[in-house]
């Protein structure tokens, strides 16, 4: 996360940490928590070759990485059809936990926005992770949670800014129907925050609005921050995820 | 020390069934997930199906699903299998193993018991 | 599902060389495991993920290779170490085992 600060630790508990096996288990993207055994995640992440099992755990809503770690195991990763690359789209993927997560004011879930919802400029959105704090730039120790206010853009204003210096043609769209644009030179997501989630203040509901993508570099001029549009995959979420009652 | 006893094999005919258990000791079963695997005579290992350690996610080999529940009882420190329209090349040694807390693999096994089914 | 295919099935070789089981797995996988098993015996853990050794296997033992090919290596075989191999992966389920490979004396 470049700018904002540490998230209080009473905020953002639906947020996860994806580890994968090494001499550590070791963060390398965010999540959210979208049902007790669900996790909502970016594509990119866990794809397109997708990690065993094996090699793959979720630690639930911690204050810094690392220090009092629970990790869950997975029993099913599902990596939407249409993914290839982020900058292509569908970058978005599921995690299904073996167990139940017991819910609590500090972990439980996020809600999913209906598919009417827009979120346009001007909503209060977070965006939350234990990335990078600027390009090629580690969150130092002890690895905090953090958050930063990000303004949402127009798909259309962020495309054509994403055009500025670009080899791309006018005429070919890079930011899709299925992203979400948000950020600026001062705040933005960043590298290990991928997979994490965009959520926006709706009527007093925290919703989430996106899921961390992709962006060139983070906080660059003209280069907000490209995020997964939750509302385009609503269908395909509750194809696995059982709704609310 | 660790260790699972399997019990509940037999001969049966076909179209039986047969409920199998596996009772573990010298560790928390409740916090392991749990697996059973089979032999059949002179043949290979094949796996037949896992259990996570609170019951809730279940997965089966495509021969055995509809035929076969896994089920545990925590309290009982149990893992069990049922076993219903036995057939003929169901005939095998059953193997309750642990999985790995960490890695991952099947770190300790029973003896083994011998179901047959045969007319 | 994925499939894993070992070779050879079988194979004969004598005190003090060096012998090599392979696994293929049918589409890529992060980890190989690796079982040992003797006649009227349990199996026993033998390699996991990949290349670490279960415990009380001795060091002339190793296991390598990623993506699809796996193997397991004996540098110098030892009579103990005549048995059935299986190889197995935990990418998804279902899980599967390969068939076997059943190291013999010549």
């Known amino acids: 996360i470049v700018g904002g600060q540490e998230a209080p630790r009473s905020k953002w508990p639906w947020q996860v940490s994806l580890r994968v096996h090494g001499p550590y288990w070791m963060h390398f993207c965010g999540g959210s928590l979208i049902h007790p055994q669900w996790v909502l995640t970016a594509a990119h992440c866990v794809g397109p070759d997708v990690k065993d099992l094996a090699a793959l755990r979720v630690q639930l809503r911690e204050q810094h990485l690392y220090y009092q770690d629970q990790l869950l195991p997975v029993s099913r990763i599902i990596v939407h059809p249409q993914f290839y690359t982020a900058q292509i789209g569908a970058d978005i993927a599921l995690l299904e936990l073996e167990e139940p997560v017991n819910v609590s004011s500090h972990v439980h879930t996020v809600t999913l926005p209906p598919a009417s919802e827009t979120f346009p400029p001007g909503m209060p959105c977070w965006v939350t992770g234990w990335g990078d704090v600027d390009n090629d730039e580690r969150l130092p120790p002890p690895f905090p949670l953090k958050q930063v206010k990000v303004p949402i853009m127009e798909n259309h204003i962020c495309d054509a800014k994403y055009h500025l210096g670009a080899y791309t043609g006018d005429d070919v769209r890079i930011v899709r129907d299925d992203m979400l644009c948000a950020g600026n030179t001062r705040r933005d997501s960043c590298q290990g925050d991928s997979g994490g989630p965009l959520v926006c203040k709706v009527n007093g509901t925290w919703l989430q609005a996106g899921v961390v993508s992709w962006g060139e570099g983070c906080a660059q001029p003209n280069r907000p921050g490209i995020y997964t549009r939750v509302t385009y995959y609503l269908d395909w979420i509750h194809h696995y995820v059982p709704k609310k009652p | 020390e660790v260790q699972l006893v399997e019990s509940g094999g037999g001969l049966v005919q076909p179209g039986g069934s047969l409920r199998l258990s596996c009772a573990a000791s010298?560790?928390?079963?409740?916090?392991?997930?749990m697996v059973w695997v089979r032999q059949a005579p002179g043949k290979g290992l094949e796996w037949v199906a896992f259990i996570s350690s609170g019951s809730s996610t279940v997965y089966y080999a495509d021969t055995m699903k509809g035929r076969f529940t896994i089920s545990r009882d925590n309290s009982k420190n149990t893992l069990y299998l049922q076993m219903n329209s036995l057939r003929a090349e169901d005939t095998a040694v059953y193997y309750c193993?642990?999985?790995?807390?960490?890695?991952?693999?099947?770190?300790?096994w029973g003896q083994g018991t011998l179901v047959t089914v045969s007319s | 599902d994925i499939q894993m295919t070992q070779s050879p099935s079988s194979l004969s070789a004598s005190v003090g060389d060096r012998v090599t089981i392979t696994c293929s797995a049918s589409s890529s996988v992060t980890y190989m495991y690796w079982y040992q098993q003797k006649p009227g015996k349990s199996p026993k853990p033998w390699i996991y993920?990949?290349?670490d050794l279960a415990s009380g296997v001795p060091s002339r033992f190793s296991g390598s290779g990623s993506g699809t090919d796996f193997t397991l290596t004996i540098s110098s075989l030892q009579p103990e170490d005549f048995a059935t191999y299986y190889c197995q992966h935990y990418h998804s389920y279902p899980l599967t085992f390969g068939q076997g490979t059943k190291v013999e004396i010549k």
């Open positions: 193993t642990r999985r790995n807390y960490d890695d991952y693999y099947f770190d300790v």
């Open positions: 010298g560790f928390t079963f409740s916090d392991y997930g």
């Open positions: 993920r990949t290349s």
